[in-house]
């Protein structure tokens, strides 16, 4: 577009008389004529070629410069070759001078020549001879000159003729600006070019509606002296819910969304989700479907899984092993885990209460990734119900009824719990006397206690046992100066309890010379 130019004066566009100031009045004349396209134009002509020392001035009206700093003057003129004019060789010239005068207001009709600043002497690239006069398309010269930077509100242009035969066909005064454009979704306003030929004016763009600046990359452009925008830096991008269409951001249509300004295009709503308005940044889940907090907006909405299948159990006294198959429907997710809910139920009304914290689960009660679990430390001869629930990332968001597989069982006789409070009562060179307390939960009648012992450095490779019915015993025939490890467990008709924690005991060193040895008090001798 040649519209990089903002016209301040265009003599050719004026149909009425220009009425510029001519001094002396006999010099430059305003004449109506036709241009090469037979369009009526107003021209100024001077052809005072007979007399020497011509000084004919023509001054434009006052030109307001607007907000321009550098002004361009384009002159179109024809200049007649002095050789085509008979008898004027000594007095005819083939150049004229261009001047300007800056002022803040119209100073009237006087031309004060001394105030004018010379821009240049203008010569024709092509003058024409008598032989060219018949052609309508006369040799039109175009010359462009710059003035500036200007500091006042306006200026006059003046043309000084020194004895040439000239027609000023067109005087165009303009400044250049970079016209408002949209680039990279940023609007850059009309910008007047800088004051110097090489200057670049940096302009910051404003994002179009529904766009935002790219992170740390503000849109900027440079307006060149020629009125051209140079390489853009940075950009705007369409906000969430909007996508680029040409130089604008249009809202995503229904059933489409765009979750982030970083995404280029709107996308169709994922499975089991919808958007019923334009400009959506995310799609809502259908009833019964959910999106976990960690789910990105582009994944489908999902639902809790169905119940595990094929739940089976195995009871070993007070331990129950449960095993099951995955649910038929994982809800569309692959983060399915399992949780076990244990309830102890009464014999009468079938009322159940949560089992409490004494129960043990192997490997764990919740977050089970495998489809089996062992539940331990149940009460003997008790009724239990176990619910196995499959859960996924959206189970906790669902308000609908839980889906689970359940099984009810009754435990058998339980082995006694662990012996506690094992103490060394007496330590000699070849014997150790121990005492302990019966288990907290005997789970029946304790028929005996079993003491296991071995030399510590043997690490249980060989060990001895001693059985006793009472809660104390003396272990004899030990080696002097040796560390032994002792563990005790209770025995009932239901089986063996767990061994007590290890107890390390060192027998006394053997004394030099004969020494009295007391007999260990024991309810039973060690079997040898």
């Amino acid at each position: 577009q040649a519209a990089k130019e903002v016209l301040l004066l265009d003599s050719k566009a004026q149909q009425t008389e220009l009425e510029w100031i001519s001094s002396p009045p006999s010099g430059w004349e305003e004449i109506s004529g036709l241009d090469e396209n037979y369009t009526p134009i107003r021209t100024y002509q001077v052809c005072q070629v007979m007399e020497p020392n011509q000084n004919n001035w023509l001054r434009t009206n006052w030109i307001s410069k607007g907000n321009a700093q550098r002004i361009f003057v384009e002159l179109k003129f024809t200049l007649r070759d002095c050789n085509s004019l008979p008898g004027v060789l000594g007095t005819c010239k083939e150049t004229f001078n261009l001047y300007y005068y800056e002022t803040d207001y119209d100073t009237g009709r006087n031309i004060r020549e001394n105030l004018y600043v010379k821009i240049d002497t203008i010569a024709a690239d092509e003058s024409f001879t008598q032989g060219d006069l018949g052609e309508r398309k006369m040799k039109l010269n175009t010359e462009v000159r710059e003035i500036g930077p200007l500091s006042k509100k306006g200026f006059y242009l003046a043309f000084q003729d020194v004895g040439a035969c000239i027609a000023l066909v067109s005087v165009k005064v303009y400044y250049k600006k970079c016209w408002s454009i949209v680039e990279n979704l940023a609007v850059f306003p009309d910008t007047v070019t800088g004051s110097e030929f090489s200057s670049l004016v940096e302009v910051r763009g404003t994002c179009v509606s529904s766009a935002e600046e790219e992170a740390e990359n503000s849109p900027r452009m440079h307006c060149s002296a020629e009125g051209e925008w140079l390489v853009p830096i940075g950009k705007c991008i369409c906000k969430a819910g909007y996508q680029q269409k040409g130089d604008t951001c249009e809202p995503c249509g229904r059933r489409f969304y765009k979750s982030s300004s970083q995404d280029l295009q709107c996308s169709r709503c994922p499975t089991h989700s919808f958007s019923d308005r334009e400009g959506s940044s995310r799609c809502e889940c259908e009833d019964g479907y959910y999106r976990a907090p960690s789910d990105p907006p582009y994944v489908a909405c999902t639902r809790p899984p169905s119940a595990p299948q094929n739940l089976i159990f195995n009871i070993n006294q007070t331990t129950v092993s449960l095993e099951w198959s995955p649910p038929a429907d994982n809800g569309g997710r692959n983060d399915v885990t399992y949780r076990i809910l244990c309830k102890r139920c009464s014999w009468e009304q079938g009322e159940c209460v949560p089992c409490g914290s004494n129960i043990g689960y192997m490997p764990q009660q919740t977050g089970l990734e495998d489809n089996y679990v062992t539940v331990m430390d149940l009460l003997a001869h008790a009724n239990y119900t176990f619910e196995v629930e499959a859960v996924n990332g959206v189970s906790d968001l669902s308000r609908s009824q839980r889906l689970f597989a359940a099984v009810s069982i009754t435990t058998g006789q339980a082995a006694p719990s662990q012996v506690s409070g094992v103490m060394k009562e007496r330590v000699l060179q070849r014997s150790v006397q121990l005492s302990w307390q019966e288990p907290e939960h005997p789970n029946g009648v304790i028929t005996e206690y079993e003491i296991k012992y071995y030399e510590k450095d043997q690490r249980e490779r060989t060990y001895s046992t001693l059985k006793t019915k009472s809660t104390s015993a003396s272990i004899n025939n030990l080696k002097p100066g040796t560390v032994y490890v002792f563990q005790i467990r209770a025995v009932t008709a239901a089986g063996y309890g767990n061994y007590s924690p290890r107890l390390d005991v060192a027998t006394l060193e053997e004394a030099s010379g004969k020494m009295f040895e007391a007999t260990a008090v024991s309810s039973e001798q060690n079997p040898v």
Epitope: Q45, M50, P52, G87, Q130, L133, G134, R136
Partner: antibody, heavy 121, light 106 residues
Framework: QVQLLQSGAEVKKPGASVKVPCKAS????????MSWVRQAPGQGLEWMGW????????TYAQGFTGRFVFSLDTSVSTAYLQISSLKAEDTAVYYC??????????????WGQGTLVTVSS | EIVLTQSPATLSVSPGERATLSCRAS??????PAWYQQKPGQAPRLLIY???TWATGIPDRFSASGSGTDFTLTISRVEPEDFAVYYC????????FGQGTKVEIK
């Protein structure tokens, strides 16, 4: 305003001379050349030639050399046409006309009212 | 010397009509002729010179065109004051006039 003033009619005998003045006013006399044009009774226009009012240098058209002389008195802004050895066929209206040179072409833009010279015995 | 021939010698038109006057050169000329109007008992008056420039005060119903050897003066709508004799004039090293065309009321 710009005008060219010529003298009244002249009646001359064959062989005589006549000097027709053309007084210019309203512009700088020396800035424009002056042409002379003859129009015989009932006839068309004939260009006789012109004089550079700045240098005094004359140019004569074919058929108007010898007996015809263009001269100036710039002090009174007057151009003169002198015809000597008048003949009956010199009977005509003689016009002075200011020459206009322009970029686009030339012409005679201001004319005197004409002086009728009658040559009769 | 270039001879200019004007035609017709007389042109009869009614006011408001278009009038077309011709001027033919004996050889190709590089410059468009000047055109003059002369009314009885008056000095000639310059109308147009250089094909595209009107003399001061000349109405734009007068226009000139042509090139080479054939030139035309056109009066788009003849007014009562336009009835007169019209001359074309060629300029250059030597200037010559055509013999004139009389435009009279029909």
């Amino acid at each position: 305003q710009v005008q060219l003033l010529q003298s009244g009619a002249e009646v001359k005998k064959p062989g005589a001379s006549v000097k027709v003045p053309c007084k210019a006013s309203g512009y700088t006399f020396t800035s424009r050349a002056m042409s002379w044009v003859r129009q015989a009774p009932g006839q068309g226009l004939e260009w006789m030639g012109w004089i550079n009012t700045n240098t005094g240098n004359p140019t004569y058209a074919q058929g108007f050399t010898g007996r015809f002389v263009f001269s100036l008195d710039t002090s009174v802004s007057t151009a003169y046409l002198q015809i000597s050895s008048l003949k009956a066929e010199d009977t005509a209206v003689y016009y002075c006309a200011r020459v206009r040179f322009t970029v686009y072409g030339d012409g005679m833009d201001v004319w005197g009212q004409g002086t009728l010279v009658t040559v009769s015995s | 010397e270039i001879v200019l021939t004007q035609s017709p010698a007389t042109l009869s038109v009614s006011p408001g009509e278009r009038a077309t006057l011709s001027c033919r050169a004996s050889q190709s000329v590089s410059s468009n002729p000047a055109w003059y109007q002369q009314k009885p008992g008056q000095a000639p008056r310059l109308l147009i010179y250089g094909a595209s420039t009107w003399a001061t005060g000349i109405p734009d119903r007068f226009s000139a065109s042509g090139s080479g050897t054939d030139f035309t003066l056109t009066i788009s709508r003849v007014e009562p004051e336009d009835f007169a004799v019209y001359y074309c004039q060629q300029y250059g090293p030597s200037w010559t006039f055509g013999q004139g065309t009389k435009v009279e009321i029909k």
